[in-house]
């Protein structure tokens, strides 16, 4: 009779994470008697995967009924595969020994490779907002994929970016890998509605890449432009002065009127109008009683936007002369403005 051989016909098996791996093994003879065991790895540190004789292996099932007479098929299935299961699996025949079984013959091994999908890319921007013309960095991270080969691209509003650096870790062999990429983006005043997209392509995704997005609205700060104008007389001795706050983002804005350096009113932007580019406009007016002033009046519109240092614009109101019409505003810009009489 020929000596038993352990046959593992598959040199390698590739399985997607979450699926079941079938590791094939047959013996060429029923003797010598003794159990089959499956191990991951070789040598003293090898990990027992299945023992025909005893033990509880909840993820492992045998392909054939190992209790059947004359069985020579010792193939196993391992369920719910994860990248941590990758490695070389050996089917090993033991011979009955006293007191312990003796390793008799091993199969050549089957390398199990696990294809694991990358996690959804997470894009994060800078901690603080930045203003147009500044360059900001965005990071993109995705984890848990295998094999190591992966492609990452950056887009801004559908246009591919080129200024980025990408690392895949670890450099050496691993059960799974992570990718980290940093892209540099120059902000423009029109970027409130812009998106930065990180796109990850991997063999497990069947040509349908994963995308992570970041809205530049979370990153950009567009500072306002101020214009103070004097409106036509409303009534004898009254002048209407408006402060137009244009093209700002985000909406958080506080406006203070100063008369000759003294605070006369403070208000918070509420009913704003939105521009096509996502920035906001707002207008505040001040009704000044000219007869209450003997000297010329310096009116200042002071705006604190998004916690930044205040910016201001001033307008000199001549008390001696009869007020002239010094500008006009559309009805839309007056909508929602606040009107107060100052005495």
């Amino acid at each position: 009779e020929e000596e038993l051989q352990v046959i593992q016909p598959d040199k390698s098996v590739l399985v997607a994470a979450g699926e079941t791996a079938t590791l094939r093994c047959t013996a060429t003879s029923l003797i010598p008697v003794g159990p089959i065991q499956w191990f991951r790895g070789a040598g003293p540190g090898r990990e027992l995967i299945y023992n025909q004789k005893e033990g509880h292996f909840p993820r492992v099932t045998t392909v054939s009924d190992l209790t059947k007479r004359n069985n020579m098929d010792f193939s196993i299935r391992i369920g719910n595969i994860t990248p941590a299961d990758a490695g070389t699996y050996y089917c090993v025949k033991f011979r009955k020994g006293s007191p312990d079984d003796v390793e008799f013959k091993s199969g050549a091994g089957t390398e199990l490779s696990v294809r694991a999908k990358p996690s959804a890319p997470v894009v994060s921007g800078p901690a603080a907002r930045a203003t147009p013309q500044h360059t900001v960095s965005f990071t993109c991270e995705s984890h848990g994929f295998s094999p190591r080969d992966i492609t990452l691209k950056w887009f801004k509003n559908g246009n591919e970016l080129s200024d980025f650096q990408t690392n895949v870790d670890p450099v050496g062999e691993s059960v799974s890998y992570s990718i980290h990429s940093t892209a540099k983006v120059v902000l423009t005043r029109e970027d409130v509605h812009s998106q930065v997209i990180c796109e990850v392509a991997h063999v497990t995704l069947q040509g349908d890449p994963l995308r992570g997005t970041a809205n530049l609205s979370e990153t950009i700060r567009v500072p306002p432009t101020l214009e103070v104008t004097q409106q036509p007389v409303r009534a004898e001795n009254q002048v209407n002065v408006t402060c137009q706050v244009r093209k700002f983002y985000p909406q958080r804005l506080q406006l203070t009127w100063l008369e000759n350096g003294n605070v006369s009113r403070t208000e918070t932007a509420s009913t704003v109008t939105e521009n096509k580019d996502g920035t906001y406009n707002w207008m505040s007016w001040l009704l000044v009683n000219v007869s209450a002033h003997r000297d010329d009046v310096k009116l200042t519109c002071q705006v604190e936007h998004d916690g930044q240092p205040a910016v201001s614009k001033s307008h000199d109101l001549k008390v001696s002369a009869h007020p002239k019409e010094q500008g006009s505003n559309t009805a839309a810009e007056n909508t929602g403005s606040n009107e107060r009489n100052i005495y």
Partner: antibody, heavy 121, light 111 residues
Framework: EVKLLESGGGLVQPGGSLKLSCAAS????????MSWVRQAPGKGLEWIGE????????NYTPSLKDKFIISRDNAKNTLYLQMSKVRSEDTALYYC??????????????WGAGTTVTVSS | DIVLTQSPASLAVSLGQRATISCRAS??????????MNWFQQKPGQPPKVLIY???NQGSGVPARFSGSGSGTDFSLNIHPMEEDDTAMYFC?????????FGGGTKLEIK
Amino acid sequence: EVKLLESGGGLVQPGGSLKLSCAASGFDFSRYWMSWVRQAPGKGLEWIGEINPDSSTINYTPSLKDKFIISRDNAKNTLYLQMSKVRSEDTALYYCATSFYGSSYWYFDVWGAGTTVTVSS
Amino acid sequence: DIVLTQSPASLAVSLGQRATISCRASESVDNYGISFMNWFQQKPGQPPKVLIYAASNQGSGVPARFSGSGSGTDFSLNIHPMEEDDTAMYFCQQSKEVPYTFGGGTKLEIK
């Protein structure tokens, strides 16, 4: 240590019934086929029958099929032999046995010490 | 059923000599390239103990003086050299198919 221990033997009248037990220890009982073998005084060995791990297959020697019932309780690690309509020729030492090492090639390498059944009026 | 006929029924052998016990099957017990024939030793008051499985393979812990041979329908168990401890009953058994059957036994004694 792999052990089998039979119990339940004793004196039984002809036509009567008796249930033998075999308690297994030292191995994963639920994975193994189990057999009953008997030996009449001064005689040879006779295989009675066997049961597979999940009780879905039970084989008997044809002449004993209608008299004996083999069962098992894996939760209790115990094999049973229900004997009925016993006759004097059923007087014997009853062994339980298994093929512990030969799962593919089959032979009895583990035996209990046996329990004696005497059929007499 | 496969019937196993053992011979001789009893045998006396001098210490140090060779004892040969034969077993003939009513039909071949070969399958899968091996012979499904086993040999057991039984001493008084003890259960049987396997000596040889698959015609020629020694059981674990069995002394080398016990050997088996044969195929198909004709098998033999050899004990050489005979020792005092070998006094016992010897049985052949086929495990090719159900019902498993045993030979009638051979009583081996020291001459």
